[in-house]
């Protein structure tokens, strides 16, 4: 390291420099009270004030005490360095509810997701656990830019026709052998058994597929109007993509969440 007796000829007899044998070059001699930031300083900016342990040099060139992580609920995230404070964070299993400079003023235990909810995002030192319903609903972005619950096809008489996507709802249709008696947005509110008809029989009820209508079953003993089975073998179902929410046993509320944010229900209600 710096030699007591620099080779004057090597450093041109300059008292502000010394010869360091280890790196074989002339180094700038930091003024008294200043300490080098590297083994062989080259200029005054390579020298700095040295602070006592547990102090750091702040932006104003002042020695400032590093924060302590001595509280039971805190752990050290980054150590005290010459130019930066120690940083404390809440210990595992806790999150910070009230932050403080380089530390946390109040730590709380992570919430446990209540019954019917599962962990969507585990708790961190900064954030509480984020919970979501254990089953559906899931969500899509509607035309208004709102996160909207996809319809559920969990009823026994429904099957999924198209899945829930980021920009479109799941669509449901009546399961084979059933026909939609009361249509609903992206689904069917009421499925009824498909009528048994002779081949080449009469026409379907007027505008059945186009409108949210209720098909009244004919009186007993009368022959209903029958449609030929569609070419793909599926019973007709309303899939008009109108942006209203399905109101059924699985209905879920629309959450006005920013489009970039993941949707989550916090167990703390926040």
């Amino acid at each position: 390291f710096p030699q007591d007796r620099p080779f004057e000829d090597t450093c041109h007899g300059n008292p502000s420099h010394y010869y360091d044998k280890a790196v074989r070059r002339c180094c700038y001699r930091c003024p008294m009270g200043l300490f080098p930031t590297q083994q062989c300083p080259q200029r005054p900016t390579d020298c700095r004030k040295q602070c006592e342990p547990d102090y750091y040099l702040d932006e104003a060139d002042r020695c400032t005490a590093c924060v302590t992580c001595s509280r039971d609920d805190l752990v050290e995230k980054t150590p005290c360095a010459w130019n930066s404070s120690r940083v404390c964070e809440c210990r595992p299993g806790m999150f910070c509810s009230t932050s403080a400079v380089n530390s946390c003023a109040r730590c709380f235990f992570h919430s446990v997701c209540p019954a019917g909810m599962i962990v969507k995002f585990p708790g961190t030192a900064q954030k509480n656990t984020v919970c979501e319903p254990a089953s559906e609903p899931d969500y899509y972005l509607d035309e208004a830019g709102r996160c909207t619950a996809c319809v559920s096809c969990s009823r026994d008489d429904l099957v999924e026709k198209t899945p829930c996507a980021w920009n479109s709802s799941r669509t449901c249709e009546c399961r084979p052998g059933m026909i939609c008696a009361t249509s609903a947005t992206n689904s069917c509110a009421r499925c009824v058994p498909y009528p048994i008809c002779a081949a080449e029989t009469v026409t379907k009820p007027q505008d059945m597929a186009e409108k949210d209508t209720t098909f009244e079953a004919p009186p007993l003993g009368t022959q209903p109007d029958c449609n030929p089975t569609p070419e793909n073998g599926e019973a007709p179902a309303s899939t008009s993509p109108t942006q209203s929410l399905l109101v059924d046993s699985q209905a879920s509320k629309t959450l006005p969440i920013p489009t970039s944010a993941p949707v989550a229900l916090s167990s703390t209600g926040k």
């Epitope: 710096p2 008292p15 001699r29 930091c30 003024p31 008294m32 009270g33 300490f35 006592e52 342990p53």
Partner: antibody, heavy 117, light 109 residues
Framework: EVQLLESGGGLVQPGGSLRLSCAAS????????MSWVRQAPGKGLEWVSG???????YYADSVKGRFTISRDNSKNTLYLQMNSLRAEDTAVYYC???????????WGQGTLVTVSS | QSVLTQPPSASGTPGQRVTISCSGS????????VYWYQQLPGTAPKLLIY???QRPSGVPDRFSGSKSGTSASLAISGLRSEDEADYYC?????????FGGGTKLTVLG
């Protein structure tokens, strides 16, 4: 409490040698530059030598080549090896902590060095 | 011959304001902080003013320092008998530290 305690002073003949020590306590010794400042009887203060990190040394022209400053951080002790002593080196030698921007913020009580035949 | 020039003596009566001057050059006072030390009779020096005009904790606000160009001064207001001491100015200079010759302050009466 910061304390600096010098020792090693005494009477020595011209051309002789003496080694002063300064035991430091109450602060993190290795984090500070240290200095020796002397005061001849009835005279003013004169800075003699300083040591920084970890072996940077600084000397007044009047002692260059004759005095050597050193430190042992493990023992929290500062030393001044004085060789080829002269009558004009007679003085009370103070050990002082030097903190950049703050100057000599703590001083020892001093140890008297007398160079006389 | 000291690098920094101070008047050898100064005096004042209790309650008075006294100023001690310190003159240097561009290589010391002109480009660095000025420090003032007080040395009471028979004791080690004590830091009185650092960074031209800052007082360490415990130093009364009767003591104040100032610097202008290559000169500095120490002012003591409300002079007290216990202020009788030697006062030294000092400054860093490239790779050494220089003191003034010292000013002996006498409190009269």
């Amino acid at each position: 409490e910061v304390q600096l305690l010098e020792s090693g002073g005494g009477l020595v003949q011209p051309g002789g040698s003496l080694r002063l020590s300064c035991a430091a306590s109450g602060f993190t010794f290795s984090s500070y530059s240290m200095s020796w400042v002397r005061q001849a009887p009835g005279k003013g203060l004169e800075w003699v030598s300083g040591i920084g990190y970890p072996y940077y040394t600084y000397y007044a022209d009047s002692v260059k080549g004759r005095f050597t400053i050193s430190r042992d951080n493990s023992k929290n002790t500062l030393y001044l090896q004085m060789n080829s002593l002269r009558a004009e080196d007679t003085a009370v030698y103070y050990c002082a902590r030097y903190y950049y921007d703050y100057g000599f913020d703590y001083w020892g009580q001093g140890t008297l060095v007398t160079v006389s035949s | 011959q000291s690098v920094l020039t101070q008047p050898p003596s100064a005096s004042g009566t209790p309650g008075q304001r006294v100023t001690i001057s310190c003159s240097g050059s561009s290589s010391n006072i002109g480009s660095n902080y000025v420090y003032w030390y007080q040395q009471l009779p028979g004791t080690a020096p004590k830091l009185l003013i650092y960074r031209n005009n800052q007082r360490p904790s415990g130093v009364p606000d009767r003591f104040s320092g100032s610097k202008s160009g290559t000169s500095a001064s120490l002012a003591i207001s409300g002079l007290r008998s216990e202020d009788e001491a030697d006062y030294y100015c000092a400054a860093y200079r490239s790779y050494d530290y220089v003191f003034g010759g010292g000013t002996k302050l006498t409190v009269l009466g």
